[in-house]
Amino acid sequence: EAHKSEIAHRYNDLGEQHFKGLVLIAFSQYLQKCSYDEHAKLVQEVTDFAKTCVADESAANCDKSLHTLFGDKLCAIPNLRENYGELADCCTKQEPERNECFLQHKDDNPSLPPFERPEAEAMCTSFKENPTTFMGHYLHEVARRHPYFYAPELLYYAEQYNEILTQCCAEADKESCLTPKLDGVKEKALVSSVRQRMKCSSMQKFGERAFKAWAVARLSQTFPNADFAEITKLATDLTKVNKECCHGDLLECADDRAELAKYMCENQATISSKLQTCCDKPLLKKAHCLSEVEHDTMPADLPAIAADFVEDQEVCKNYAEAKDVFLGTFLYEYSRRHPDYSVSLLLRLAKKYEATLEKCCAEANPPACYGTVLAEFQPLVEEPKNLVKTNCDLYEKLGEYGFQNAILVRYTQKAPQVSTPTLVEAARNLGRVGTKCCTLPEDQRLPCVEDYLSAILNRVCLLHEKTPVSEHVTKCCSGSLVERRPCFSALTVDETYVPKEFKAETFTFHSDICTLPEKEKQIKKQTALAELVKHKPKATAEQLKTVMDDFAQFLDTCCKAADKDTCFSTEGPNLVTRCKDALA
């Protein structure tokens, strides 16, 4: 229903704490360079204003849209043009164009230093001094680095952070309590970020229908006992929630997500038998839990899919008269039978089915034409299954770091024009799929691997879009979202690439590498590996292994040496010479 004051309505629905958190996230995602203090001041002003509207909905400006109110706040920031350049031009526009303009200026790769975690003692001190400010900093720092982070989920991670600090700061050994727990939250939050970015990409590039199809497949896998009408309702609601968050309407998004969680918990009987434990939790935990709830048990008596979608006499009529309903039903029926498939694969199968009907239905004998469509799915299913087997075997053989290196070589050969930092980031993220998915039971591997890879490749596409350098990458990124992963997998060595000149300084290292944390050391070595491949794109795996082993040995020797600097300066050039010879 319409409310006299939108801001008062959202403040009342969400409560002050969540309201403030969401406004802070919104501002941090729009203006990614502003300091926490600048944003905190704006948030306080907006909150105070919301309270006046709660007290009197007819008060001045209370009837304005949230976009107008928030946009006016952002546009009133001093030195906007100096700090943000052409983003300031957005302020010359009227709503809704102004908000669209802000969205277009969100930067997926802002030039901000990595979010460094303070040491345990310092963290606990500032947390105890002012938990609210501490959590505000967390929201601000994450949101500005991840401008599409799913806002209500970020509140959930902040809550997790809070609980971990509350528990660990009371321990004697704070460090060993905090580190693994916070690392766990960080890892989950980073995965959540790339997954949500993929959803926003789907929405932005292909519209609501594409996202809704994704949601139908995902929900049908999770809730195979829910009927099509129920799945459609959930998918429609979920699409609205995500559209709002992707569009910067974070208060509406969080409010509607809470409503959706409430609806699901009130209708468990028609949705799933697995929801009760989630529904017993408080709001943020409940919504999070529902988003990753285990699949319900599949009904035992599901008829063969062919009955309604191949053998039925009305297949073509049903398709032509209501594609959305007919193909939606196909996606629902196929997905509920295949929790072992990735959503990407299910969408490819639905696309293949649609294309087959579009080709066959106008023919003289349509059933003869589309009769083999289900058999034609086989190669589409086998391809990702083989991908999972091959990659998980390789991961088990090499371990995470070795697997990342194998992927780095492969992707540098596919797209050597891409910047080394981007290739290293992508390979490290793609390589984590092993740890994340290959240890799972067989029937969970494929959905885990492919949907995770798709989300990581979406980030590769977003970064490449900013500065397009590789025709290979452009080709894969400009197709449909569900075809990206197979497209990247199918890429081979880029024959058009002219190898990079060998520069000794690229492979020159100093003793400071010895004191770096293990992760940073790995990144340095992987940077060198990518550069080697750019120099010799057709180097064999054996040649690269020889060089990298030599390099690891060199680091080990020099980092153990009494005079590290001398070791690096004398042995370094020898290493470079050996590398050149090995790759000659």
Epitope: C316, K317, A320, E321, D324, E358, K359, A362, E363, P366
Partner: antibody, heavy 121, light 110 residues
Framework: EVQLLESGGGLVQPGGSLRLSCAVS????????INWVRQAPGKCLEWIGI???????FYATWAKGRFTISRDNSKNTVYLQMNSLRAEDTAVYYC???????????????WGQGTLVTVSS | DIQMTQSPSSVSASVGDRVTITCQSS???????LSWYQQKPGKAPKLLIY???KLTSGVPSRFSGSGSGTDFTLTISSLQPEDFATYYC???????????FGCGTKVEIK
């Protein structure tokens, strides 16, 4: 050379009926979907309906009930039967083939030259 | 109700000019089922572009189509004398019965 040729147009009184023909030469009609599209003088193109190779028909919502499409593959001809004609049905009527490989998409690659239907008393 | 809005309704241009015609659909077309036709006076329409951006064989490469969902564009990069005509977009939707054409854009000599 593939050709579509409409015939049967002319002057008809309001409330009257008319049957248009679309004779196809150069291809075997039995493999193709044929559409009827009309264009009132100086106005927009308006899709009327389609008949698939199998004989299945679909119509624009406004055309259901008054217009019927049929085909006679032995004569390589498609027909448009129009009943209860009104002044606003005055238009040039075209038949057009759907691009092979599509069934429901608005891609029509071969067109007739059109036949004029005038509904007037 | 399906709406297919073409703009502008007419445009005056000279040989060599770049001409852009837009077509807005409500709701969005199905799966990029969007075509562009060229029609000259007294003649039948001619299919130029299908699937929003694919050129029909024999159509000069100065014609190009782009867009997705609800917003589509036909561009003639360098107008030739034979390009003066009326251009129509056609859209396909979830139901075949909703197949709709725009009302045309007349490209006239300036």
């Amino acid at each position: 050379e593939v050709q579509l040729l409409e015939s049967g147009g002319g002057l008809v009184q309001p409330g009257g009926s008319l049957r248009l023909s679309c004779a196809v030469s150069g291809i075997d009609l039995s493999n193709y979907a044929i559409n009827w599209v009309r264009q009132a003088p100086g106005k927009c193109l308006e899709w009327i309906g389609i008949i698939w190779a199998s004989g299945t028909t679909f119509y624009a919502t406004w055309a259901k009930g008054r217009f019927t499409i049929s085909r006679d593959n032995s004569k390589n001809t498609v027909y448009l039967q129009m009943n209860s004609l009104r002044a606003e049905d005055t238009a040039v009527y075209y038949c057009a083939r759907t691009v092979p490989g599509y069934s429901t998409a608005p891609y029509f690659d071969l067109w007739g030259q059109g036949t004029l239907v005038t509904v007037s008393s | 109700d399906i709406q297919m809005t073409q703009s502008p309704s007419s445009v005056s241009a000279s040989v060599g000019d770049r001409v852009t015609i837009t077509c807005q659909s409500s709701p969005s077309v199905w799966s990029n089922f969007l075509s562009w036709y060229q029609q000259k006076p007294g003649k039948a329409p001619k299919l130029l572009i299908y699937e929003a951006s694919k050129l029909t064989s024999g159509v000069p490469s100065r014609f190009s189509g782009s867009g997705s969902g609800t917003d589509f564009t036909l561009t003639i990069s360098s107008l030739q004398p034979e390009d003066f005509a009326t251009y129509y977009c056609g859209g396909g939707y979830s139901s075949i019965s909703d197949t709709t054409f725009g009302c045309g854009t007349k490209v006239e000599i300036k």
